[in-house]
């Protein structure tokens, strides 16, 4: 008999949903490793980055309803009491405890589909989600450390003679900024209360044969490059070109 083992390779399916919202579903990678088990069934946890403002679907282990007694989703969000959504097969009843976010729901009736959905993921959905399937011979668990990703707003401008500033504003997690060519750079990070981070990189180029510089912003939501032509005139400002 096989209990699923933790797997680092994520199977992220993306499609378009109503209201033009992207939807991602992270369920078990079918090529997972399995092992023999007795009564203690392995706990499987997956770290899952998901973009803000998309829809997310979280899945339980692959166990047929006929084998189940109770299905429970346990949701632990920062600064909130633990929320549980439970379905008891024998009585066909669902029960919720401390669940206030109406965007987190069963995909459909739990007797038809045990998946959990988060409609329009927000920063506040960062947390731990766990499906617990109770069978007569033990429990199966599937856990998700949900990390909400926020795409930073990227700007690039020249503020002084041969000095450029590249900013990745309110990203989650913090973006990484690099320059081509490399210059004399200073980078600062500003942390916001909602968990986002603004990264500001200021670079100066003494070498006069450098006329165009590129700021490259790396982020889990995608990478972005902007370039600017360095103006020799002090105090002149030039906005960036995206490519």
């Amino acid at each position: 008999e096989g209990a699923a083992q933790p797997n680092n390779s994520l199977m992220l399916q993306t499609s378009k949903e109503n209201h033009a919202l992207a939807s991602s579903s992270l369920c078990m990678d079918e090529k997972q490793i399995t092992q023999n088990y007795s009564k203690v069934l392995a706990e499987v946890n997956t770290s899952w980055p998901v973009k803000m403002a998309t829809n997310a679907v979280l899945c339980c282990p692959p166990i047929a309803l006929r084998n189940l007694i109770i299905i429970t989703w346990e949701i632990i969000l920062r600064g909130q009491p633990s929320c549980t959504k439970a379905y008891k097969k024998e009585t066909n009843e669902t029960k919720e405890t401390n669940c206030t976010d109406e965007r987190i729901t069963w995909v459909s009736r739990p007797d038809q589909n045990s998946d959990l959905q988060i409609r329009t993921v927000a920063i506040t959905h960062d947390g731990y989600y766990r499906c617990i399937m109770v069978t007569p011979d033990g429990n199966f668990h599937r856990g998700y450390h949900l990390q909400v990703l926020v795409t930073p707003e990227v700007t690039l401008f020249q503020n002084r003679n041969r000095t450029a500033v590249c900013k990745a504003v309110a990203g989650k997690p913090a973006a990484h900024i690099s320059w081509i060519p490399e210059g004399d750079c200073a980078t600062k990070q500003e942390y916001w209360s909602n968990g986002t981070v603004t990264v500001k990189s200021t670079c100066h180029w003494e070498v006069h044969n450098v006329s165009t510089v590129t700021c490259h912003v790396s982020h889990l939501t995608g990478n972005k490059s902007l370039y600017i032509e360095l103006l020799p005139v002090p105090g002149a400002k030039k906005s960036a070109k995206l490519y």
């Epitope: 339980c60 692959p62 998946d115 069978t135």
Partner: antibody
């Protein structure tokens, strides 16, 4: 070690009934759903139905509804499959198989019981 | 009900050959990231033996020359290098709510 041991071969006349037993050992009998599957000579495997000894839930293939009856004796850790109104086309090997939770797969099978229906 | 169509129904092969068997479902057997398709081997007078479960997971104790792939409606069982003990009949099987078996593929000695 998980084992499923079935009753011996049977020869029946058309119109009669047959009851095949499947004795389970090596695990808690009430914890797992038991399926019944048959295989006629040279034919594909065919699902008859299942019984969940935990709560006595049963489900049958439409083809066998009204003719097949699945029961279990928890104290004896035994599942039974009774098929009535036998016809010659019911001649087959009948298997019990324990459904394992993860993926709803069959790791453990009985050795099979040959039921011959002949006048 | 979901119908499973296996092909070929029989094939002749030699020891060491790579063998591929396909199974097509009348509708998708994949749900919630899992494909509820299993593969069994059966020898005369014996019950089926599980080889692959959930489309691609190798059952404990099964040689690594057996592998499974596919999702949705199309699935494949591959034996990378056929061994003398592999001559048997192979079945695909779906078991989510209702149980269905494919028609079987008999692998014979060439």
């Amino acid at each position: 070690e998980v084992q499923l041991v079935q009753s011996g071969a049977e020869v029946k006349k058309p119109g009669a009934s047959v009851k095949v037993s499947c004795k389970a050992s090596g695990y808690t009998f009430t914890s797992y759903v038991m399926f019944w599957v048959r295989q006629a000579p040279g034919q594909r495997l065919e699902w008859i139905g299942y019984i969940n000894p935990y709560n006595d839930d049963t489900k049958y293939n439409e083809k066998f509804k009204g003719r097949a009856t699945l029961t279990s004796d928890k104290s004896a850790s035994t599942a039974y499959m009774e098929l009535s109104s036998l016809r010659s086309e019911d001649t087959a090997v009948y298997y019990c198989a324990r459904e394992d939770y993860y993926g709803s797969r069959f790791v453990y099978w009985g050795q099979g019981t040959l039921v011959t229906v002949s006048s | 009900d979901i119908q499973l169509t296996q092909s070929p129904s029989s094939l002749s092969a030699s020891v060491g050959d790579r063998v591929t068997i396909t199974c097509r479902a009348s509708k998708s057997v994949s749900t919630s990231g899992y494909s509820y398709m299993h593969w069994y081997q059966q020898k005369p007078g014996k019950p089926p033996k599980l080889l692959i479960y959930l489309a691609s997971n190798l059952e404990s104790g099964v040689p690594s020359r057996f592998s499974g792939s596919g999702s949705g409606t199309d699935f494949t069982l591959t034996i990378s290098s056929l061994q003398p003990e592999d001559f048997a009949t192979y079945y695909c099987q779906h078991n989510r709510e209702l149980l269905t078996f494919g028609g079987g593929t008999k692998v014979e000695i060439k």
